[in-house]
Interface confidence: low
């Protein structure tokens, strides 16, 4: 079985390793499929994508029956597979099979905490975002270890990419100094950024 | 074709329950949209209650309602449901359910539209 | 809180062009959505994203953005067209719908 791992909006080609010359493409079935779902199937010549790979997908005929697809999104994750099968003796038989397994990351960044005043009070408001990564993100806000209440957190997923963004909203007292860290954890991972407020010189210090 | 149908009680006494559920028929309940419950007076207009997500279970809720409200759906019924607790003649108004595609969300969303909308129907809080 | 403005109403005869506006802060970098409602009926999307329309939206339905300004055009008014007319966009920062107040369409 062959890996290939990519990252998330990458183009990923998948090589079913074995060639059909342009002649014998009339007595030839290809068939692409990921987890018994059909991808791409050529018979006799004519080409049939299915529609979560149309517009995507490209069938490299010349490149080993490559299928590229592009944009990767965090569902074509898994296991493709490619049947080659050749008309010998009134009957299709199988001539070639071969298994891809495709691992697509989508890694949220370093979230980004940006800060601002509220008019005529003691309060301050942070928010932190982070976008472009999966599964899905829990924020939480820690102050020494403990959790905050945020205002409002936001998670959105983008129906064409399949990837999450979250943002959060936390106010806070600017006249006692604080360290606040924003924390997103994502199925086994995490990202964190930490937000400093000094009283003394009324700043704030990012940790980057 | 998507249609959204709804039911539930039409009269209620301040501080009761106001509950109501959409059907949705031609199309899944999961998906990406956002169920949503939207209702109208003559004084606020169109106001947007809160939602719930096709795909998952998240909900957002309209502020000036959140500790009041609560969505939830069915997806085996092809369902969702509005509460609306501790109700007073502030809430009387139409109630509409709708379906939103989610909006396009790349460092935050934007773009969402209302395409679908239920009959609707009055909701009149009364002692 | 996101807010958008409109006119209260706008009277338009027959065959003319209606014009109505929606005014937001930021309604420049959003896409504004615009329903229409007839009385004792349910709002029916005709301009979404600014300017396309769905399908089954007469053409005479159209919608244009200047800076912070939309505006929904309806050419070659007629009686069937009035009605109430809100406009709509995504509180990005809330992830949330927020319509404005509507506008009336009387047709003399």
């Known amino acids: 079985v062959i890996h290939v791992t990519k990252e998330v909006k990458e183009v990923a080609t998948l090589s079913c390793g074995h060639n059909v010359s342009v002649e014998e493409l009339a007595q030839t079935r290809i068939y692409w499929q990921k987890e018994k779902k059909m991808v791409l199937t050529m018979m006799s010549g004519d080409m049939n994508i299915w529609p979560e790979y149309k517009n995507r997908t490209i069938f490299d005929i010349t490149n080993n029956l490559s299928i590229v697809i592009l944009a990767l999104r965090p569902s074509d994750e898994g296991t493709y597979e490619c049947v080659v099968l050749k008309y010998e003796k009134d009957a299709f038989k199988r001539e070639h099979l071969a298994e891809v397994t495709l691992s697509v990351k989508a890694d949220f960044p370093t979230p980004s905490i940006s800060d601002f005043e509220i008019p005529t009070s003691n309060i301050r408001r942070i928010i932190c975002s982070t976008s472009g990564g999966f599964p899905e993100p829990h924020l939480s806000w820690l102050e020494n270890g403990e959790e905050l209440n945020a205002i409002n957190t936001t998670v959105s997923q983008d129906p064409e990419t399949e990837l999450y963004a979250v943002s959060s909203k936390l106010d806070f007292n600017m006249t006692t100094n604080h360290s606040f860290m924003c924390l997103i954890k994502y199925g086994h991972l995490r990202v964190n950024q930490t937000f400093n407020w000094n009283t003394t010189k009324q700043e704030h210090f990012p940790d980057n | 074709q998507v249609k959204l149908q709804q039911w539930g009680e039409g009269l209620l006494q301040p501080s009761e329950t106001l509950s109501r559920t959409c059907v949705v028929s031609?199309?899944?309940?999961?998906?990406?949209?956002?169920w949503t419950w939207i209702r109208q007076t003559p004084g606020r207009g169109l106001e947007w209650i809160g939602h719930i997500y096709g795909n998952g279970a998240t909900t957002n809720y309209n502020p000036s309602l959140k500790s009041r409200v609560t969505i939830s759906k069915d997806t085996s019924k092809n369902q969702f449901f509005l509460n609306l607790n501790s109700v007073t003649d502030a809430d009387t108004a139409v109630y509409y359910c709708?379906?939103?595609?989610?909006?396009?969300?790349?460092?935050?969303?934007?773009?969402?539209?209302?395409?679908?909308w239920g009959p609707g129907d009055l909701v009149t809080v009364s002692s | 809180a996101y807010e958008l403005t409109q006119p209260p109403s706008v009277s338009v005869s027959p065959g003319q062009t209606a014009r109505i506006t929606c005014g937001g802060d930021?309604?420049?970098?959003?896409?504004v959505h615009w329903y229409q409602q007839k009385p004792a009926r349910a709002p029916i999307l005709v301009i979404y994203d600014d300017s396309d329309r769905p399908s089954g939206i007469p053409e005479r339905f159209s919608g244009s953005k200047s800076g912070n300004t939309a505006t929904l055009t309806i050419n070659g008014v007629e009686a069937g067209d009035e009605a109430d007319y809100y406009c709509?966009?995504?509180?990005?920062?809330?992830?949330?719908?927020?319509f404005g107040g509507g506008t009336r369409v009387t047709v003399l």
């Open positions: 930021n309604s420049r970098n959003e896409y």
């Open positions: 709708a379906r939103g595609p989610r909006p396009d969300c790349t460092t935050i969303c934007y773009g969402g539209w209302v395409d679908v």
């Open positions: 709509q966009v995504w509180d990005r920062a809330s992830d949330h719908p927020v």
């Open positions: 031609g199309g899944s309940i999961s998906g990406y949209y956002y």
